[in-house]
């Protein structure tokens, strides 16, 4: 709590300008009128204040708007947004996409904080739905935000947003989310050539079907083991030994270290031991020579 002290003669702020730049904490408290601050919030961003000074300005706004700031003030918070708590933001009613963009711009370069998460939550609730414009904005600022959405919400993400996604942004996505994102990525990157396409699509391959993996195996992509281990088991199982060898290229040797882990373990169980032996890796657990493999799922489908 800042002590109430009289404003020194000649220091009363008639407008929010850089004359306030070196005001002490108590001078800002005593000499800046909260209503003036609220109407000239846009000017605050043109003045480099210390965090201590920003705390005083925030305190003034809190006193003026105990029930939460109006959107006209929120839109111009600028750097002061970084001083807001999730509790402050829960009092807001943010409906303008421009306001959201302005505040996300302020937070650019920072990780997604609890404040930003709360802001986005308030915005979506205020709008009543997660429309494409909103998603486009959010994914542009926080590609990692994709993984916090449900598969249903992801279905309305425009493929153009996929371009902003970095590999690490998909680290927390589960297979159901990748199932939705992969076709979008495939569409987004469809005009790229082979090697460039693979670099971009690699992070999304956890949602790729068997036929796409087969196609990739014909393109000398040299998939690393980390990517292979994230593939859908049901997509890997139908691949032949030759296809996996082509898919992994020089990385095929890494299969030995992963032979007890899915999807490699399950894939080995589906291969003929003869075929596995051609890799020369000592992989064991394949179908013994002379055994007949019946695909019961195919039989059921025919009947």
């Amino acid at each position: 709590e800042v002590e109430k002290t009289a404003c020194p003669s000649g220091k009363k702020a008639r407008e929010i300008d850089e004359s306030l730049i070196f005001y002490k904490k108590w001078e800002l408290e005593a000499c800046v009128d909260a209503a003036l601050l609220a109407t000239q919030m846009d000017r605050v961003n043109a003045i480099p204040f210390t965090y201590e000074q920003l705390d005083v300005l925030k305190h003034k706004l809190d006193e003026l708007y105990p029930q939460g700031y109006p959107e006209s003030v929120i839109q111009h918070l600028g750097y002061l947004f970084l001083k807001m708590s999730p509790e402050d933001i829960r009092k807001w009613n943010v409906t303008s996409l421009e306001t959201l963009k302005a505040l996300l711009e302020v937070n650019k370069g920072h990780e997604m904080s609890p404040q930003v998460a709360t802001l986005i939550d308030r915005f979506v609730k205020g709008r009543g739905q997660l429309d494409k414009d909103t998603l486009d904005t959010l994914t542009a600022f926080y590609p990692g935000y994709l993984c916090s959405l449900s598969p249903e919400e992801l279905s309305s993400v425009p493929p153009s947003s996929i371009w902003a996604v970095r590999p690490q942004d998909l680290d927390t996505c589960d297979p159901r989310q990748l199932d939705v994102l992969y076709p979008k990525a495939r569409l987004a990157f469809q005009n790229m050539n082979g090697s460039e396409y693979f670099v971009k699509i690699q992070s999304f391959l956890g949602g790729a079907p068997t036929e796409d993996l087969k196609a990739l195996s014909q393109q000398n992509v040299s998939m690393d083991l980390a990517t292979f281990m994230k593939l859908r088991t049901d997509a890997v199982l139908p691949l032949t030994v030759a296809e996996v060898q082509k898919l992994l290229g020089p990385h095929v040797e890494g299969l030995k270290a992963e032979e007890r882990h899915r999807p490699v373990r399950d894939w080995i169980l589906r291969q003929r031991q003869d075929d596995l032996d051609t890799l020369g890796l000592g992989l064991q657990g394949g179908i013994p020579n002379g055994y007949l493999v019946l695909d019961l799922s195919m039989q059921e489908a025919l009947s």
Epitope: E18, I21, F22, N45, P48, T50, Y51, E52, G78, L82
Partner: antibody, heavy 119, light 106 residues
Framework: EVQLLESGGGLVQPGGSLRLSCAAS????????MSWVRQAPGKGLEWVSA????????YYADSVKGRFTISRDNSKNTLYLQMNSLRAEDTAVYYC????????????WGRGTLVTVSS | IQLTQSPSSLSASVGDRVTITCRAS??????LAWYQQKPGKAPKLLIY???SLESGVPSRFSGSGSGTDFTLTISSLQPEDFATYYC?????????FGGGTKVEIK
């Protein structure tokens, strides 16, 4: 190219005066608060003085208050530091630094100019 | 506000993970910046607001902390990272710097 270039350093006797200049280019000089930061030989950094974008507001560290004067000429994109009553402890490399638009960290620095106060 | 950096110097090899700490004499929220300075050169901004990476700075540099305790981490030291590192608070005036941490080749 965005840059700051200091000049005016040199050898001066105790009690003497010196005026440092910092020429700015590649950005809207008047939009930024500017600072002088110094570094004594083999020592750390010390914030000496600062000035607002228009030049209307100034700040001085206690160690130089009353002896140094910071000013700027926005029409010439130049920052100045007038140093009077110089002491041996003012010997340092003096850097001109641009304050970020939003708060008080320094996002652009000059190469520095050496001031030596010695008899 | 006084800023105390530790260690004052350290020896490390290329590829090492290096951690430098900065402790403030009182709480400064996240009002902290980190700079790198090479001999005979001007300081260069690396991190601001305790954890935000300045544009153009390699991602091997990261900052963390809030309140009184802050950390600068170099995930995999490169030959060009051998330098002196300074923290600076901008919570209030006068702005102050830490004493510096010199990172030398082992």
């Amino acid at each position: 190219e965005v840059q700051l270039l200091e000049s005016g350093g040199g050898l001066v006797q105790p009690g003497g005066s010196l005026r440092l200049s910092c020429a700015a280019s590649g950005f809207t000089f008047s939009s930024y608060a500017m600072s002088w930061v110094r570094q004594a030989p083999g020592k750390g950094l010390e914030w000496v003085s600062a000035i607002s974008g228009s030049g209307g507001s100034t700040y001085y560290a206690d160690s130089v208050k009353g002896r140094f004067t910071i000013s700027r000429d926005n029409s010439k994109n130049t920052l100045y530091l007038q140093m009077n009553s110089l002491r041996a402890e003012d010997t340092a490399v003096y850097y001109c630094a641009r304050t970020s638009r939003t708060t008080w960290y320094f996002d652009l620095w000059g190469r520095g100019t050496l001031v030596t106060v010695s008899s | 506000i006084q800023l105390t950096q530790s260690p004052s110097s350290l020896s490390a090899s290329v590829g090492d993970r290096v951690t430098i700490t900065c402790r403030a004499s009182q709480g400064i929220s996240s009002a902290l910046a980190w700079y790198q300075q090479k001999p005979g050169k001007a300081p260069k901004l690396l991190i601001y607001d305790a954890s935000s990476l300045e544009s153009g700075v390699p991602s091997r540099f990261s900052g963390s902390g809030s309140g009184t305790d802050f950390t600068l981490t170099i995930s995999s030291l490169q030959p060009e990272d051998f330098a002196t590192y300074y923290c600076q608070q901008f919570n209030n005036y006068p702005l102050t710097f830490g004493g510096g941490t010199k990172v030398e080749i082992k």
